[in-house]
């Protein structure tokens, strides 16, 4: 369980010519409110389909009256966040619709009148527990700036809110396969969905409490390797009692991938590699343009002004795929030598070297550094018969004993503000930019307003996403 939170920063005229008329006037004062509708996955459903993940209405904003002759400014907004609680797992990919509504406060018969000012929509990939994601969307001549995040409600944790935190059962450690619950280090993560003890490598579940075995494994917790000698076929789910494999269809049989996608089997199911212009679990989502926001993880969308011309996603470092949907596992190439630990920081690779080694890839042997201590996590580096300390982020000086200012080099582009942080630095980007160093402009989506629908919350069909 958890909460999706939406913070509206501004709603007003977009840049460029053709500024919209103010929605309110001295004769017709009005106030704004917002509605958000969430659907799981990358749905192509119509705006009127149920908000299966949930929906929320904001409070009404302050009353606004246009000043005669003045252009429409950013309009006064309601206080607070829009919060959409979700009961089950956070799906990771979701579609949203944000509607801006006007409530006219004149002397209408029968009370205030509502009308839809703008509707924006998009599809995003988002992990629960992550930082606020910023976005800008256009609807006609209007521009909406907002941030959003998904957070888990205790005791749920994890990127999908599918793990629970529980008090430790032993003072110094968590159970097998369970991690401490940051920041609650005195608690442990415990599986919520599958049967307790179900092997994380060889078991999975599609129903809470069960433990289904991957090919080649059996037993109540999928910890027993299958003996296939007496069996007919090496494929299919294992029988719990016999440990024998039963013939079954392969997940790629009949190619479930549409639109020319190619299918590859995964341990639990299948994965489609889609041609450009298509995506979704089975490559079934098509006719996508940059206005649909198809590039994930901060990818920049170029081209694709209409459904017939393909868009291209320029992916930030650390991501790949036609929609920047795949994280590049650059550590799998084992770039760190001499037993160094590889860390993929997204924007860069870092090797954490074992004692006695240094260099970007731990390629330098530092025998004469053996007795040399570099403070604060610094590494001693051999150089021309002498030694020096290569200091960790935030430290400097001969022995890394002096605090360095990681912001001194002005690393944040496009006017982003730099903050020193225990792990290095953090950039707070100026509006319109994103990325670890604010290097990517946010490409506006330009979705046009859709026909009005009456405000109010429609309950979604009951669905579980476990």
């Amino acid at each position: 369980a958890g909460v999706f939170e939406l913070q509206i920063h501004s709603f007003g005229p977009g840049p460029g010519p053709g500024a919209p008329r103010s929605p309110c006037s001295a004769r017709l004062p009005c106030r704004l409110f917002f509605r958000v509708c969430l659907k799981p996955g990358l749905s192509e459903e119509a705006a009127e389909s149920p908000c299966a993940l949930g929906a929320a209405l904001s409070a009404r904003g302050p009353v606004y009256t246009e000043q005669p002759g003045a252009p429409a400014p950013d309009l006064p907004l309601p206080d607070g966040l829009l919060q959409v609680p979700f009961r089950d797992a956070w799906p990771g990919t979701f579609s949203f619709i944000i509607e801006t509504w006007r409530e006219e406060l004149g002397d209408q018969i029968g009370g205030p009148a509502w009308s839809l000012l703008a509707r924006v929509a998009g599809r995003r990939r988002l992990a629960a527990g992550g930082p606020w994601a910023r976005d800008i969307q256009r609807a006609g001549a209007w521009e909406l700036r907002f941030s959003y995040r998904a957070r888990c409600e205790p005791p749920a944790v994890g990127t999908a809110c599918t793990r629970l935190c529980r008090p430790r059962s032993a003072p110094s450690r968590c159970g097998p396969g369970l991690r401490p619950c940051a920041p609650l280090e005195d608690e442990c993560e415990a599986p919520l969905v599958c049967r307790a003890g179900c092997s994380p490598e060889h078991g999975f579940c599609e129903q809470p409490g069960e433990c289904r075995c991957l090919e080649g494994w059996t037993g109540p917790l999928c910890t027993v390797p299958v003996s296939t000698s007496s069996c007919l076929s090496p494929r299919g789910p294992s029988s719990a009692t016999t440990g024998c494999l039963v013939p079954g269809p392969g997940p790629c049989d009949g190619n479930p991938c549409a639109n020319g996608g190619s299918c590859s089997e995964t341990p639990r199911s299948f994965e489609c590699t889609c041609p450009r212009g298509f995506y979704g679990l089975r490559c079934e989502v098509s006719g996508v343009t940059c206005a649909d926001g198809p590039c994930f993880n901060g990818g920049l969308c170029v081209g694709g002004a209409d459904p017939d011309s393909a868009y291209i996603c320029h992916c930030p470092p650390g991501f790949q795929g036609s929609n920047c949907e795949k994280r590049v596992d650059r550590c799998s190439l084992q770039p760190c030598r001499n037993g160094g630990l590889c860390l993929d920081l997204g924007h860069a690779l870092r090797c954490r070297c074992r004692a006695g080694f240094a260099g970007p890839r731990c390629e330098h042997d530092l025998d004469d550094c053996a007795g040399r201590a570099c403070a604060n996590g610094g590494t001693c580096v051999e150089g021309g018969g002498a030694h020096r300390c290569s200091c960790a982020l935030g430290f400097g000086g001969r022995d890394c004993r002096e605090r360095a200012d990681p912001c001194a080099a002005r690393p944040c582009a496009h006017g982003g503000r730099c903050y020193a942080h225990f792990s290095g630095l953090v950039c707070a980007c100026a509006p319109g930019y994103m990325g670890a160093r604010c290097e990517f402009p946010v490409h506006p989506d330009g979705a046009s307003a859709l026909p009005a629908a009456p405000p109010g919350l429609r309950p979604g069909d009951p669905q579980r996403y476990l």
Epitope: S169, P176, P191, R195, G209, P220, V224
Partner: antibody
Framework: QVQLVQSGAEVKKPGASVKVSCKAS????????IEWVRQAPGQGLEWMGE????????VYNEKFKDRVTMTVDTSTSTAYMELRSLRSDDTAVYYC???????????WGQGTLVTVSS | DIQMTQSPSTLSASVGDRVTITCKAS??????VAWYQQKPGKAPKALIY???YRYSGVPSRFSGSGSGTEFTLTISSLQPDDFATYYC?????????FGQGTKLEIK
Amino acid sequence: QVQLVQSGAEVKKPGASVKVSCKASDYTFSNYYIEWVRQAPGQGLEWMGEILPGNGNTVYNEKFKDRVTMTVDTSTSTAYMELRSLRSDDTAVYYCARWGDYALFANWGQGTLVTVSS
Amino acid sequence: DIQMTQSPSTLSASVGDRVTITCKASQNVGTNVAWYQQKPGKAPKALIYSASYRYSGVPSRFSGSGSGTEFTLTISSLQPDDFATYYCQQYNSYPFTFGQGTKLEIK
């Protein structure tokens, strides 16, 4: 806290059937296996089988599979174990237990004594 | 079926003693072993799971160890409440099986 409350003691004749109930409370009944274990007088524990209420999946001990049926009623969070063709050596205390959030039988019912006697 | 053999069958000890109960599996069960305590006329109570992890609320004097086929339950300093019968159980393979029990009595 989690509770499993079992039905009362039964006296049966050989060849008859017995149906023991186990009512669960204070947890999501569908999401955890219910285990059935019996203990003959002065003897050890013997596992009979299990059922996952969420989908009705059962696994029975081969020793009992021709005589036992495990069912659930999710509307009342109650599990049932029926044992047929009773014999005198089926005289035992029958326990239900819950496979909990850790890998073991975390919570147990108070037990139901079934006496088979002619 | 996997046999779980406990030893000793009966153990006499005094309050404050350190006692160890062993359990041998007839084949490899990894660490999929639990220990339970049972008092006369009562249902068993969970003590240890995954061979060495104490269940919540179980006092720290109880500890478990072992993997593969040999497992031990240790009570570091016996308390009056600890005199009971103890059972090991494997849940690596169906059917789940229990040891025959070890009765811990006052010397």
